[in-house]
Amino acid sequence: DWVVAPISVPENGKGPFPQRLNQLKSNKDRDTKIFYSITGPGADSPPEGVFAVEKETGWLLLNKPLDREEIAKYELFGHAVSENGASVEDPMNISIIVTDQNDHKPKFTQDTFRGSVLEGVLPGTSVMQVTATDEDDAIYTYNGVVAYSIHSQEPKDPHDLMFTIHRSTGTISVISSGLDREKVPEYTLTIQATDMDGDGSTTTAVAVVEILDANDNAPMFDPQKYEAHVPENAVGHEVQRLTVTDLDAPNSPAWRATYLIMGGDDGDHFTITTHPESNQGILTTRKGLDFEAKNQHTLYVEVTNEAPFVLKLPTSTATIVVHVEDVNEAPVFVPPSKVVEVQEGIPTGEPVCVYTAEDPDKENQKISYRILRDPAGWLAMDPDSGQVTAVGTLDREDEQFVRNNIYEVMVLAMDNGSPPTTGTGTLLLTLIDVNDHGPVPEPRQITICNQSPVRQVLNITDKDLSPHTSPFQAQLTDDSDIYWTAEVNEEGDTVVLSLKKFLKQDTYDVHLSLSDHGNKEQLTVIRATVCDCHGHVETCPGPWKGG
């Protein structure tokens, strides 16, 4: 029959060439002379001339060694024709399978592989995967089957076998406990890939395993005891810098310190922060310390990390003895702002109040007093006793110096320390009203017609406070009542002035006496301009000129 079984040819054959492989034979050769030919890639198309056929015998020839890794299978067609060139058979499929030889070593995909694993992990933890390829056949033979192994490990601490490798997948895993970044931060493994499933050619590469940091070291105070001196009353004052050492990776959350005042700060006087670069604990005062109340504080500070510990670790504690230094403190007026009620207009030399200060210092320091600010110059202060007396007339109605009935004075106390310190106090004198102002009308100039005059309404004001104000009473004096009338309205806060007799055009003085509810009387002269006119007028018209 015109058929041929698949032909297997080993790659890398040594010849001699041409090498006879198989004979093509048509049973039509009994009837006529047959000529054989082959076509296809490897025969008459690229790669041309690898195979040929003896035209008359039908022997299939191999002309050169084959390379399976280049072409693993050739598909050719055999042809049989008679002398006249007529085809005597259908084209026959010829399959030539190139069988593998182990002519390639494994190759790692990288010269150096890099992986990482957390320190302190359990055996069995995967680290990384390495890969090697082999061009040889791994399906029908072991030529391309790669087996991985670890040849060596550096350093060999704490065990010479810290890692193992899956022989088929190349996955590197931890096999021994004891990975400690602080002792060995990196391992270098020489890895091997061997074909023939471990029995053939070997190639090597390097796997570098970085050991990642875990928070397995507690920060430790160094030193653990501190003594510091702080002046009393200082706020935000740096008391002490506390130093810690931590074996974990610098500037990582496992290294960065977190400080906590565990005891000794009952009054919440202190605070502690972490310096971002040095990792030191900066102890500062949150509030001023008081030497007189407590001259020594013993603080207990604990340090941990930003990251939690991965295992149970003892925490380090520091003891800080803070000595509070005495400072000459300023005297403090008690109260800092003192309100005193005093009648306005009290006689000169009359006592107003005693305003004294206390010195926080325990020494019996002498305090002297003086007035610092007395805008109207109404007061004096005894330097020894703090007695404040009137030396001017206290006037509640003085709008320049008195606001809302209050006259504000600043006083100063000075101790005899070295150097001396001063403290100030505010004396707020609430001036009690006295009926020392009579009522006054507004306006004090009026213009009125001498015929059918309009009544003039004047507002009455009194600088005093109730009850030394309305209702007011009005009275005309000095014969002003011959031509004029003055009446207070029902509310008692305005006076109505009326012209009751004819007066020729001129300017007149109207003598008006107003008294308040406390009978304080005030005489006011109203300048009245009388005009020759009827009814309402604002200014007198000029003299009438006839034509």
Partner: antibody, heavy 117, light 111 residues
Framework: EVQLLESGGGLVQPGGSLRLSCAAS????????MSWVRQAPGKGLEWVSA????????YYADSVKGRFTISRDNSKNTLYLQMNSLRAEDTAVYYC??????????WGQGTMVTVSS | QSALTQPASVSGSPGQSITISCTGT?????????VSWYQQHPGKAPKLMIS???KRPSGVSNRFSGSKSGNTASLTISGLQAEDEADYYC???????????FGGGTKLTVL
């Protein structure tokens, strides 16, 4: 000579607690992972729990997860197994074993835990 | 169900050789050369007989030997003696947790 000595076993009622200890000597304790393996009467070996040399990593079998706690004190060369909410199926001999050179060796002599009402 | 498969029992006469098999997968026995064999006498703790497939710890008789082919490991005891009668367990390293898998155990009877 490397030695492991377990203690703390005994009879306990279901729901009760026990704490097993394993005292180690003859090797650098903190450099090795340690394990607890148990063997129920007439049965095979079952891995219960393991802990890394530093104590930072632990493993528990699903059958004991949430009930047992493994710990170690490297300053005392001692391994512990705190067993809470004990059940009848936890009845077994409990062995501690050192993991090194790719194997469990040596094993302690074992301590018997019986959970019964 | 154990991860590694062992025959439940084997037996042999004194002086004979016996082999106990331990079959795993390509991710344990087949992947790593960390197969161990333990001997356990009744009421006693397991004792390591073979580590790393074929290494004998000091003090273990050279009658005990180990080997591995593919996913199956074997323990061979030659010149069987009465004191060899015990339970034998195999174990293998595997990546992941737990990192050790055990066989179900084989009871060796010396006839």
């Amino acid at each position: 000579e490397v030695q492991l000595l377990e203690s703390g076993g005994g009879l306990v009622q279901p729901g009760g607690s026990l704490r097993l200890s394993c005292a180690a000597s003859g090797f650098t304790f903190s450099s090795y992972a340690m394990s607890w393996v148990r063997q129920a009467p007439g049965k095979g070996l079952e891995w219960v729990s393991a802990i890394s040399g530093s104590g930072g990593s632990t493993y528990y079998a699903d059958s004991v997860k949430g009930r047992f706690t493994i710990s170690r004190d490297n300053s005392k060369n001692t391994l512990y197994l705190q067993m809470n909410s004990l059940r009848a199926e936890d009845t077994a001999v409990y062995y501690c074993a050192k993991w090194g050179d790719g194997t469990l060796n040596p094993w302690g002599q074992g301590t018997m835990v019986t959970v019964s009402s | 169900q154990s991860a590694l498969t062992q025959p439940a029992s084997v037996s042999g006469s004194p002086g004979q050789s016996i082999t106990i098999s331990c079959t795993g997968t390509s991710n344990d026995v087949g992947a790593y050369n960390y197969v161990s064999w333990y001997q356990q006498h009744p009421g006693k703790a397991p004792k390591l007989m073979i580590s790393e497939v074929n290494k004998r710890p000091s003090g273990v008789s050279n009658r005990f030997s180990g080997s591995k082919s593919g996913n199956t490991a074997s323990l061979t005891i030659s010149g069987l003696q009465a004191e060899d009668e015990a339970d034998y367990y195999c174990s293998s390293f595997t990546s992941g947790l737990p990192w050790v898998v055990f066989g179900g155990g084989t009871k060796l009877t010396v006839l």
